[in-house]
């Protein structure tokens, strides 16, 4: 079953390499188990950045070494990606799956273009 997913078109990462965006899905109801995956598309290659499964009403739990953190509220997921560098600039796609109860629903957003600019190094001071 297809599900609409909305996310912003463009986000600029902070000077510290942190980018945040909201992924909203048009849920047909209240799934008790939801899986959110962030995919990065660059040069026609798609790679998984991070993924979390959460029970409705609970926090998103990414793996300890994940560069992602997030919170959920209703049918919105607030995602934050950390440790970004200029080479990480690309299209970040939000994929949402309603895992339980059945039936399974899948929604894939159009992607958020995240621009990352490496900070200029501070000049040496005398």
């Amino acid at each position: 079953k297809a599900m609409h997913v909305a996310q912003p078109a463009v986000v600029l990462a902070s000077s510290r390499g942190i980018a945040s965006f909201v992924c909203e899905y048009a849920s047909p109801g209240k799934a008790t188990e939801v899986r959110v995956t962030v995919l990065r598309q660059a040069d026609s290659q798609v790679t998984e950045v991070c993924a979390a499964t959460y029970m409705m009403g609970n926090e998103l739990t990414f793996l300890d070494d994940s560069i992602c953190t997030g919170t959920s509220s209703g049918n919105q997921v607030n995602l934050t990606i950390q440790g970004l560098r200029a080479m990480d600039t690309g299209l970040y796609i939000c994929k949402v799956e309603l895992m339980y109860p059945p039936p399974y629903y899948l929604g894939i957003g159009n992607g958020t273009q995240i621009y990352v600019i490496d900070p200029e190094p501070c000049p040496d001071s005398d």
Epitope: S27, P28, G29, K30, G74, P101, P102, P103
Partner: antibody
Framework: DVQLQESGQGLVKPSQSLSLTCSVT?????????WNWIRQFPGNKLEWLGY???????YYNPSLKNRISITRDTSKNQFFLKLNSVTSEDTATYFC???????????WGQGTTLTVSS | DIVMTQSQKFMSTSVGDSVSVTCKAS??????VAWYQQKPGQSPKPLIY???YRYSGVPDRFTGSGSGTDFTLTISNVQSEDLAEYFC?????????FGAGTKLELK
């Protein structure tokens, strides 16, 4: 496409039980979703009565107390409403409908009119 | 139970006009609100779900908005086939509840 069709009594006497059937085609009621009964009173007010889930679970509107039972026959892909001790207040059009858990109703039957009268 | 209040039982409009049907929830229901259209002798048909998403095949002149407790269904460029009764529905909390309906009529 998914289709739901209600059938059953059109006239019931007060204090008796009403029994309605919803026949589903185009989707197995054990594969997913929740299968509901909703009624519409004269004047068009809608009231959700209860569901039977794909897994056989039930939840009923507390306003109906212990008068309601929703069951199913998976071999016939049907589910049923039984409402006991009916009064004239139960006169309504009864719809069956499908939803995702705690979700909106995407498919409805055409409705069957039930009158409670002696 | 959550009460969904549609304060206007009837609304008059003309073909080509824009009309807004409102619904107020007695407590916060987030964005878990749907709108249905019902014509005489028919079952309700879903128009909008999750507050603002159009159901498959619904014309884009129907738009939904709101969150929390206040919700609006807007019909722009009203057509004669839009003359019907409109119900809001909350699916945030069981028991699921509906508004009393707003009937759209020609002026």
């Amino acid at each position: 496409d998914v289709q739901l069709q209600e059938s059953g009594q059109g006239l019931v006497k007060p204090s008796q039980s009403l029994s309605l059937t919803c026949s589903v085609t185009g989707y197995s009621i054990t594969s997913g979703y929740y299968w509901n009964w909703i009624r519409q009173f004269p004047g068009n007010k809608l009231e959700w009565l209860g569901y039977i889930g794909y897994d056989g679970s039930n939840y009923y509107n507390p306003s109906l107390k212990n008068r309601i039972s929703i069951t199913r026959d998976t071999s016939k892909n049907q589910f049923f409403l039984k409402l006991n001790s009916v009064t004239s207040e139960d006169t309504a059009t009864y719809f069956c409908a499908r939803n995702y858990y705690s979700g909106y109703f995407d498919f409805w039957g055409q409705g069957t009119t039930l009158t409670v009268s002696s | 139970d959550i009460v969904m209040t549609q304060s206007q039982k009837f609304m008059s409009t003309s073909v080509g006009d824009s009309v807004s049907v409102t619904c107020k929830a007695s407590q916060n229901v987030g964005t878990y609100v749907a709108w249905y259209q019902q014509k005489p002798g028919q079952s309700p048909k879903p128009l909008i779900y999750s507050t603002s998403y159009r159901y498959s095949g619904v014309p884009d002149r129907f738009t939904g908005s709101g969150s929390g407790t206040d919700f609006t269904l807007t019909i722009s460029n009203v057509q004669s086939e839009d003359l019907a009764e409109y119900f809001c529905h909350q699916y945030d909390t069981y028991p699921l509840t509906f508004g009393a309906g707003t009937k759209l009529e020609l002026k």
